[in-house]
């Protein structure tokens, strides 16, 4: 048995910051599981996880650099990455582990969501002032 | 799904007994299987689970010391071993299937229970 | 350990009546919990999984209710094959601890 996962097919980063929502077909609450995002079509980067155990607090934390945190619904978890480079734009997917009780389950891989960073348009100030009129 | 319990048993006080729970009719080792007690007169009682993927077990802390959960993947089968048998473990056991419905537990196959007598 | 309180111990009612059966657990357990039925001499036999949902075959005049600490059985309708006992069981964690149970008797 798989659980299966949906994501926007599409979200726009415009102030360098996102929620991506990853809905599953599974009650994450009574369960011990890890949750992650990963980017680019092969999955490579581990962007953010999540750990929860139904007795305790959730860890949230990245090992490559990105700012993230994540919150928990019943059926779905949200990261919330902030911080992003126009050069992140990129497709990223959700993954689920369930870790306990028995027996371990995870994901079909679902179809990812492209976040398209868009910079923050500040007016370009001139690096060297006209020439001043007399 | 199946679950096929030994018969009844007679002991002695102070003695064991090992009660077996043969699981037929889907994958052995991908279900944990728990174990109830249902006393005369009284409310069912959770001992614990066993899941035969990993050999994982739970125990009800009250169980500890008195039942001990294996199994033998080869027939199937999980068992439940009780020591130190006193009138107090007179009762019904039953072993039951626990089934995942996306998240929520609960255990819709049960096998028909075997009844332990403790008497001198 | 979780702590469930079902209530009422017994009831005796007659045919054609509707009879609530209620479970309080001393935390919340967001809906992990489950309604059996049993028969004297039998197996119990599940109702209700996830606090509301209707095991396939089970008649519809069982139903679910409840969140958080407090949860209900509801039987409406009653038939003479519904006279037996009946248990709510949490599965928050270990021990998966069952009520009580409450006897359902014929009036």
């Known amino acids: 048995n798989k659980i299966l996962v949906k994501q926007s097919p599409m979200l726009v980063a415009y102030d360098n910051a996102v929620n991506l929502s990853c809905k599953y077909s599974y009650n994450l609450f009574s369960r011990e599981f890890r949750a992650s995002l990963h980017k680019g079509l092969d999955s490579a980067v581990e962007v953010c996880v999540v750990y929860g155990n139904y007795s305790q607090q959730l860890q949230v934390y990245s090992k490559t650099g990105f700012n993230c945190d994540g919150k928990l619904g019943n059926e779905s978890v949200t990261f919330y990455l902030q911080n992003l480079y126009v050069n992140q734009t990129d497709i990223y997917f959700c993954k689920i582990e369930v870790m306990y009780p028995p027996p371990y389950l995870d994901n079909e891989k679902s179809n990812g969501t492209i976040i398209h960073v868009k910079g923050k348009h500040l007016c370009p100030s001139p690096l060297f002032p006209g020439p001043s009129k007399p | 799904v199946k679950l096929q319990q030994s018969g009844a048993e007679l002991v002695k006080p102070g003695a064991s007994v090992r009660l077996s729970c043969k699981a037929s009719?889907?994958?052995?080792?991908?279900?944990?299987i728990h174990w109830i007690k249902l006393r005369s007169g009284q409310g069912l009682e959770w001992i614990g689970w066993?899941?035969?993927?990993?050999?994982?077990?739970q125990y009800n802390a009250k169980f500890k010391g008195k039942a001990t959960l294996t199994a033998d993947k080869s027939s199937s089968t999980v068992y439940m071993e009780l020591t130190g048998l006193t009138s107090e473990d007179s009762a019904v056991y039953f072993c039951?299937?626990?089934?995942?419905?996306?998240?929520?537990?609960?255990?819709?196959?049960w096998g028909q229970g075997t009844m332990v007598t403790v008497s001198s | 350990d979780i702590q469930m309180t079902q209530s009422p111990a017994s009831l005796s009612v007659s045919v054609g009546e509707t009879v609530t059966i209620t479970c309080r657990t001393n935390?919340?357990?967001?809906?992990?919990l489950a309604w059996y039925q049993q028969k004297q001499g039998k197996s119990p036999q599940l109702l209700i999984y996830?606090?509301?949902h209707l095991v396939e075959g089970v008649p519809s005049r069982f139903s679910g209710s409840g969140s958080g600490t407090q949860y209900s059985l509801k039987i409406t309708s009653l038939q003479s094959e519904d006279f037996g006992n009946y248990y709510c069981?949490?599965?928050?964690?270990?021990?998966?601890?069952f009520g009580g149970g409450t006897k359902l008797e014929i009036k």
């Open positions: 039951a299937r626990r089934d995942d419905f996306s998240g929520y537990d609960a255990l819709p196959y």
């Open positions: 009719g889907y994958t052995f080792t991908e279900y944990i």
């Open positions: 066993f899941y035969p993927g990993s050999n994982d077990i």
């Open positions: 935390e919340n357990i967001y809906s992990n």
């Open positions: 996830a606090a509301t």
């Open positions: 069981q949490h599965f928050w964690g270990t021990p998966c601890t």
